[in-house]
């Protein structure tokens, strides 16, 4: 997900509706004017605000990256919602790009969870049922290790 460059909006654009602030704040879908006297509407499909605010300009809509699909478009009160394409995922804690899901589990493990836009497949040990964490070879790959190679972490 990427943000467009931020730039103050042209305050007097004719298509922007104006209203008065309430207690110094403007409602969702608006931003406050520089003199604080007006609430100026965001531009549909270009920028937005989701809460009462005193922003001098609306926030620019997110554009979905390649590798993402747009679940819902940007409106004046809600940012674009992007999701990883099928077969890829993005964990909440991971970098901002979609990663390919593994195609299978390592030997001695079974799949208990499918690939979703938010998580890789989930594998557990056949015997103990403990989860496997970390990158591992897919089931089709040959697992080779030299002496002293540490085992993959399991939790």
């Amino acid at each position: 997900i990427t943000q467009q460059d931020l730039a103050p909006q042209q305050r007097a654009a004719p298509q922007q509706k104006r209203s008065s602030p309430s207690e110094g704040l403007c409602p969702p879908g608006h931003h406050i004017s520089e003199d604080g006297r007006d609430c100026i509407s965001c531009k549909y499909g270009q920028d937005y605000s989701t809460h009462w605010n005193d922003l001098l300009f609306c926030l620019r809509c997110t554009r979905c990256d390649s590798g993402e699909v747009e679940l819902s478009p940007c409106t004046t009160t809600r940012n674009t919602v992007c999701q990883c394409e099928e077969g890829t995922f993005r964990e909440e804690d991971s970098p901002e790009m979609c990663r390919k899901c593994r195609t299978g589990c390592p030997r001695g493990m079974v799949k208990v969870g499918d690939c979703t836009p938010w998580s890789d497949i989930e594998c557990v040990h056949k015997e103990s049922g403990t989860k496997h964490s970390g990158e591992v070879p897919a089931v089709e790959e040959t697992v080779t290790s030299s002496p002293g190679t540490p085992a993959s972490p399991c939790s």
Epitope: I1, T2, T50, N53, D54, L55, L59, T62
Partner: nanobody, 126 residues
Framework: EVQLLESGGGLVQPGGSLRLSCAAS????????VGWFRQAPGKEREFVSA????????YYADSVKGRFTISRDNSKNTLYLQMNSLRAEDTAVYYC???????????????????WGQGTLVTVSS
């Protein structure tokens, strides 16, 4: 390691005021948006307010609009929440939080925040 330490909570009468502070020990504080959330007993954690990295512009939840004011001092790595006209329904543990990633300029949902303080209790009662 990100550390956030809230302070300033306490017992206050309805209509009273409190000022919460949150000290952050992270070098990126001054380049990140930051927010306040609260959690009342038996309820889910909810958004209160968030402020841009530069302090120019903020979001407020409907329930606190016009009563609470968020501010920050980047030179002190500190976030503030001035709470006026407090009501019984404002009683909660208040948390400050930093977002987990930089893909939203002003995040306002719990899932967008990854670093949390331990909270400070605000009780509004007569």
């Amino acid at each position: 390691e990100v550390q956030l330490l809230e302070s300033g909570g306490g017992l206050v009468q309805p209509g009273g005021s409190l000022r919460l502070s949150c000290a952050a020990s992270v070098s990126t504080f001054g380049t990140s948006p930051v927010g306040w959330f609260r959690q009342a007993p038996g309820k889910e954690r909810e958004f209160v307010s968030a402020i841009r990295w530069d302090g120019v512009g903020a979001y407020y939840a409907d329930s606190v609009k016009g009563r609470f004011t968020i501010s920050r001092d980047n030179s002190k790595n500190t976030l503030y929440l001035q709470m006026n006209s407090l009501r019984a329904e404002d009683t909660a543990v208040y948390y400050c939080a930093l977002p987990r990633r930089g893909d939203s300029e002003l995040p306002s949902t719990v899932k967008e925040y990854g670093y949390w303080g331990q909270g400070t209790l605000v009780t509004v009662s007569s």
